[in-house]
């Protein structure tokens, strides 16, 4: 009888194990385990009557197709084998035992007692056949396996092969190389790869194949497995297979579309191809007067590009515009896409005309093309170009006016500062105790008129300032306060400020420039208790022009020393002249000013001990700070006084020979002006000048307006 | 130290002027204005007005105008009050203080008496 | 012109206790500028006044921190935490914000 076993493991015994088992019988174990999996037996007991080539009692194992083994007796000899240690294997997921005994036994024989069990089948090892095994990678687990690909492959459907996915190759470039995948490799299997070659209509691609042609063929039927086709407009050119590369083919289009396939066996390098296109010819182009053109070619065919340039100074002239080069492209009907330009010479036109300044050509007939010359020069002697560079510039190839430090920015005219028309005298009579000073001696000195008429009456006061720039006004910050508010510093408004530059005579103004104020910057920690930080500047409203009555001062480099003591400077002002004029006697007379006539007075630069001892003996608050130093005499005599609030003290810088503002005019007291041992106090402006150039918009040349150490 | 000295006691007939002075010292007289504050016997005070010790400029309250006047000696650092045509209603402590609105610091007094 | 109520008229204080007193102006100080001008002063027995607080809040120098002002708008406060004996005499209150500058009544603080 037959007895049918699934599962992964069993025992198997001969019938009346471990008895003797009985004759004439014939039992039939067929095993059936899952595939992937093998069937391993082996004999734990074996004990069968002996018999040549086991015709007697034997135990048979076998597939459907083969006998693995026969087994009987009790040890092996020449005729008969028993199974000891020995192990089998099905090659299959299914195994068939057959145990058969005669008719007779001579002897007691207890048979057998046999194991089996299902063992994984390690198919990556195993598999010969093409057909069956991966293409790539082989992976077993326990009852099967699966294939995987390499980096840029795919798996087929079929689960084994590996293709690559090559439908997308568009080339749009008029020359190229196109090759199977994985080229001079062999190429993946079960693949259909799709090149385009896609041009411009005009063009036409010619294709070569190069190198090694090697696609699996047949030798009596074309092409079957791999092959190359491709298609050029209506034609299709191919199949192509085998070792023998086509022809060059001129496809006679702009567009080919090739077709590559493969299938899933062999293992062949592929091929190689370069393309490339051609079109029609243009005629040589001709070459410009002054003029060149690259690329230079023997010929020239659709598509090409030429840019035409000129020699240096030089413009191409295209339809009345001039350009730095101009490109034609030779197009499919074999002409160019545009004439060929003309070359111009560069014409830099009419030099920009300068503020405060003037233009002279150095060229015949003033010319303004290229490698002509002009020069700027400033109004002297109120301005001076910055840098003091030569002024000359040169009409470049470009067509632009260009100096050899400036490039093509213009010159800047900045003014003069500190060097009056009129030289300052030396000495000066023993302000208070000053004298008039004569129009155009202080071209600086500015009349700064506040008039409150917000409030009920009206406020009105005035006070001094020195011309730093064209725009710019620098006075005390004082004299800019409003007194309304006390223990606050708040400046006036602007819409109450006038300044009056080149004045002379307060009485007539008709000669002088009055202006009205843009902008009133106070310093930001100017103290009203202590005068700490009395500096401030009035934008005007628009820049006034300079002459012999009305030029900057410069400002002092920004050293914290100020200047030293015993230096003499010079103050102007037209406050109280006479110390015993009263406030009430000069508003009572209707001019606001204290005095007609401009006044000056020189004054030594005190030690600033002797000044700081002179004001902290007295009773009060006073304290001269290290922004602040002091000028006047021991002895009195010669002072400013009211009035003079915010004007400059000037001393002659002996190096460039320029008046320098190193002090305005701030505050003193508490004796009268002019009085013994009662020193004038000044800001000291050195201490200032970041502050001051950072409100003003610092210029690229200090120097110019500010006298460095 | 800031010190407002004022003058003396005065005695006045009906319809005569009186000058008040109040001298100033220990800070910068131009930075602050000066106040002119009224205060009638066993009465509150009573603001007359201010000037402006940079440009000399008198603002005077409604009450206070006509008659009154402010004015100043920069140089001497010394504001004055004048009362012009002295009435009864005028016996009274006039004070001097430093600001026109601040008033942080009181001069002693000046006491104005006018009676026939 | 801004009127200055003060309140109580006086004030009967004992040593080592606290007092306060009321300032209302009929309109609000607050300045366009932001700061509120409200002052207050102490005028003692036979002297002259005294600036105690400026800006609502802000004591002079040498003023003892005994004294606080406070308050916005139209209400405004000074305050005593103990008084001492040398705080006797009138104090006034005073606006510098709306022209002409206006004081109150006074209040007279004085020791039981």
């Known amino acids: 009888h037959t007895v049918e076993l699934n599962n992964m493991f069993g025992q198997i015994q001969s019938p009346g194990y471990p008895d003797s088992y009985p004759s004439d019988s014939e039992v039939t174990w067929n095993i059936t385990v899952p595939e992937g999996f093998r069937i391993k037996l082996y004999f734990m007991h074996f004990n069968l009557e002996s018999s040549y080539l086991c015709e007697y009692d034997y135990v048979k194992v076998e597939t459907e197709e083969q006998v693995l083994a026969t087994f009987c007796g009790r040890e092996t000899t020449d005729t008969e084998q028993t199974p000891g240690q020995e192990v089998v294997f099905s090659p299959g997921s299914f195994m068939s035992i057959t145990f058969r005994s005669d008719f007779s036994n001579e002897e007691r024989f207890t048979g057998f007692d046999a194991h089996y069990m299902a063992v994984d089948v390690d198919e990556c090892t195993e598999r010969e056949d093409e057909e069956l095994s991966c293409d790539h990678y082989c992976h077993n687990y326990i009852g099967g396996y699966y294939c995987s690909c390499r980096f840029g492959y795919l798996l087929h459907t079929d689960n084994r092969t590996c293709r690559v996915e090559c439908s997308d190759n568009v080339y749009t470039q008029r020359t190229g190389v196109i090759t199977s995948p994985d080229f001079p490799n062999p190429y993946p299997k079960s693949s259909e790869c799709f090149y385009t070659i896609e041009l411009e209509e005009g063009f036409m691609v010619s294709l070569q194949f190069e190198d090694i042609f090697d696609i699996e063929d047949h030798p009596e039927v074309p092409c079957p497995y791999d092959y190359i086709k491709i298609k050029a407009g209506p034609k299709v050119l191919g199949p192509f297979c085998g070792e023998k590369a086509p022809e060059p083919i001129n496809t006679e289009s702009h567009s080919v579309q090739i077709l590559f396939r493969s299938d899933n066996s062999g293992e062949n390098q592929g091929w190689r191809l370069s393309y490339r296109a051609t079109g029609n010819e243009c005629p040589d182009p001709e070459l410009p007067v002054h003029g060149k053109i690259e690329p230079l070619q023997a010929t020239y065919s659709f598509k090409d590009q030429v840019l035409i340039s000129c020699d240096t100074g030089y413009k191409v002239l295209k339809d009345n515009v001039e350009m730095d080069t101009f490109q034609i492209e030779c197009l499919k009907d074999g002409t160019w896409s545009n004439r060929i330009p003309t070359c111009k010479i560069a014409d830099c036109g009419a030099p920009a005309e300068l503020k405060h300044g003037l233009i002279t050509f150095s060229t015949r007939n003033n010319l303004t093309t290229y490698k002509s010359e002009i020069q700027y020069s400033c109004q002297q002697p109120y301005y001076k170009m910055l840098h003091n560079i030569t002024g000359v510039y040169t009409c470049s190839a470009q067509g632009v006016w260009m100096n050899e430090v400036l490039g093509r920015s213009q010159p800047t005219c900045l003014p003069v500062c500190g060097q009056p028309s009129r030289s300052l005298p030396n000495l000066v009579k023993r302000i208070i105790g000053g004298r008039n000073a004569e129009p155009g001696l202080f071209p600086w000195q500015a009349l700064i008129v506040v008039e409150d008429t917000s409030r009920v009456p009206n406020d009105k006061w005035f006070g001094s300032g020195a011309l730093l720039s064209e725009s710019w006004i620098l006075t005390a910050a004082h004299v800019l306060r409003s007194q309304r508010r006390d223990n606050t510093v708040t400046p006036v408004s602007k819409e109450h400020v006038t300044v009056y530059l080149g004045l002379h005579d307060v009485r007539d103004k008709s000669g002088a420039v009055n202006s009205s104020a843009a902008q009133v910057v106070l310093h930001p920690d100017f103290n009203i208790q202590n005068y700490n930080h009395d500096i401030a500047l009035v934008q005007l409203r628009e820049p006034v022009p300079l002459g012999p009555h009305v030029m900057p001062i410069c400002l002092p480099s920004p050293e914290p020393e100020g200047p030293e003591p015993h230096m003499l400077g010079l103050v102007a002002g037209w406050g109280i002249s006479n110390p015993n004029v009263t406030v009430d006697e000069i508003i009572s007379s209707g001019t606001r000013t204290l005095s007609d006539v401009l006044q000056y007075v020189k004054l030594p630069v005190v030690p600033y001990a002797e000044c700081k001892t002179s004001y902290e003996s007295r009773s009060g608050n006073y304290s001269v700070t290290e922004n602040m130093f002091c000028a006047g005499y021991y002895e009195g005599g010669k002072d400013t006084c009211l009035g003079d609030s915010g004007g400059a003290f000037v001393i002659l810088d002996d190096l460039s020979q320029r008046w320098v503002a190193q002090g305005l005019v701030s505050w003193g007291g508490p004796e009268e002006c002019g009085s013994k041992q009662v020193y004038g106090v000044y800001t000291k402006v050195s201490n200032y000048v970041d502050w001051l150039w950072e409100q003003m918009g610092s210029p690229q040349g200090l120097g110019d307006l500010q006298v460095e150490r | 130290q800031i010190q407002l000295v004022q003058s003396g006691p005065e005695l006045k007939k009906p319809g005569e002027t009186v000058k008040i002075s109040c001298k100033a010292s220990g800070y910068i007289f131009t930075s602050y204005g000066m106040s002119w504050v009224r205060q009638a016997p066993g009465k509150g005070l009573k603001w007359m007005g201010w000037?402006?010790?940079?440009?000399?400029?008198?603002t005077y309250a409604d009450d206070f105008k006509g008659r009154f006047a402010f004015s100043l000696e920069t140089s001497a650092r010394t504001p004055y009050l004048q009362i012009n045509n002295l009435k009864n209603e005028d016996t009274a402590t006039y004070f001097c203080a430093r600001g026109g609105e601040a008033m942080d610091y009181w001069g002693q007094g000046t006491s104005v008496t006018v009676s026939s | 012109d801004v009127l200055m109520t003060q309140t109580p008229l006086t004030l009967s204080v004992t040593i080592g206790q606290p007092a306060s007193i009321s300032c209302k102006s009929s309109q609000s100080l607050l300045d366009s500028d932001g700061k509120t001008y409200l002052n207050w002063l102490l005028q003692r027995p036979g002297q002259s006044p005294k600036r105690l607080i400026y800006?609502?809040?802000k004591l002079d120098s040498g003023v003892p921190d005994r004294f606080t002002g406070s308050g916005s708008g139209t209400d405004f406060t000074l305050k005593i935490s103990r008084v001492e004996a040398e705080d006797l005499g009138v104090y006034y209150c005073w606006q510098g914000t709306h022209f002409p500058w206006t004081f109150g009544g006074g209040t007279k603080l004085e020791i039981k």
């Open positions: 800006l609502v809040s």
């Open positions: 000037i402006n010790t940079y440009s000399g400029v008198p």
